[in-house]
Interface confidence: medium
């Protein structure tokens, strides 16, 4: 059965000034890739966090990523502020070579 | 690029402690496990263990417990593995390797070059 | 502990044919989840061992198309469809259903 990504919550309401909790678990192992965060679609999209690669000082994961078959790929984001406001979107990429290709979004 | 780079070989007496480094780079290093494995001269492949970089659990070889310790550095992005108690027959290429990516990678999908520790008195 | 076997110890063989690896474990590496936990590596003469297979069937990335894994259970086979003079080497499977991670004793490819 193809991979599915299922964000379970369709908003979320946040204070500012406290974390942010945004849902994603993917539905199979396979293909192998990692998992991105964007806010807003399309070109202009703003990366939020790259399971790969990269440093995201407000952005921890629930669950462990280096367990194996954990697929849970929700996220926290602290210290929310009204500029956080947006659609935020969990998307699996496929392991490529050399660049990994966009797979899948929830 | 992605690599990891392991510190240079070691030549210890028996009975003496080694730690081995593993320094990462290329790649978000919490999303990955380590696994450390050695290989004797001329010999196979032998799995001593694995770290969690994210929250630093375990899970040892039972015939290296009690003698093993695998750690972390997340602020320098390197792993350790600590030997005690040597004797001649650790004498191996002590490698690590980037394991269990959950979603990103399957075991272990990049190694270092390994370190080469010789055990003689 | 989880034994694998592999079969043959060594095998020679001639550039542009093909060549089977097996290997048979003593448990079966089916996870409940439906993947067979069983890697395949390769270690080139003077390199660290490299990713050729997991969970079974799957290619690593970068790794040519001549190079296939198949089998469930306790029983794998890795084929390599037309040997080239680069594919040297020992291989060697490892399951990573349960720890200690466990590899096969390996099987050297050399060029007859």
């Known amino acids: 059965e193809e991979l599915q990504v299922i964000q379970p919550d369709k908003s979320v309401l946040v204070a500012a000034g406290e974390t942010a909790t945004l849902r994603c678990t993917a539905t199979s192992l396979i293909p192998v890739g990692p998992i991105q965060w964007f806010r807003g679609a399309g070109p202009g999209r703003e990366l939020i966090y790259n399971q790969k690669e990269g440093h995201f000082p407000r952005v921890t994961t629930v669950s462990d990523l280096t367990k194996r078959n954990n697929m849970d790929f929700s996220i926290r984001i602290g210290n929310i502020t009204p500029a956080d406001a947006g659609t935020y979107y969990c998307v699996k990429f496929r392991k490529g070579s050399p660049d990994d290709v966009e797979f899948k979004s929830g | 690029q992605v690599q990891l780079v392991q510190s240079g070989a070691e030549v210890k007496k028996p009975g003496a402690s080694v730690k081995v480094s593993c320094k990462a780079s290329?790649?978000?290093?919490?999303?990955?496990?380590i696994s450390w494995v050695r290989q004797a001269p001329g010999q196979g492949l032998e799995w001593m263990g694995w770290i969690s970089t994210y929250n630093g659990n375990t899970n040892y070889a039972q015939k290296l417990q009690g003698r093993v310790t695998m750690t972390t550095d997340t602020s320098t992005s390197t792993a350790y593995m600590e030997l005690r108690s040597l004797r001649s027959d650790d004498t191996a290429v002590y490698y690590c390797?980037?394991?269990?990516?959950?979603?990103?990678?399957?075991?272990?999908?990049?190694w270092g070059r390994g370190t080469l520790v010789t055990v003689s008195s | 502990d989880i034994v694998m076997t592999q079969s043959p110890l060594s095998l020679p063989v001639t550039p542009g044919e093909p060549a089977s690896i097996s290997c048979r474990s003593s448990q079966s590496l089916l996870h409940s989840n439906g993947y067979n936990y069983l890697d395949w590596y390769l270690q080139k003469p003077g390199q660290s061992p490299q990713l050729l297979i997991y969970l079974g069937s799957n290619r690593a990335s970068g790794v040519p198309d001549r190079f296939s894994g198949s089998g469930s259970g306790t029983d794998f086979t890795l084929k390599i469809s037309r040997v080239e003079a680069e594919d040297v080497g020992v291989y060697y499977c490892?399951?990573?259903?349960?720890?200690?991670?466990?590899f096969g004793g390996g099987t050297k490819v050399e060029i007859k």
């Open positions: 290329g790649y978000t290093f919490t999303s990955y496990g």
């Open positions: 490892m399951q990573a259903q349960g720890t200690p991670y466990t």
């Open positions: 390797a980037r394991d269990q990516g959950t979603g990103t990678t399957v075991d272990l999908d990049l």
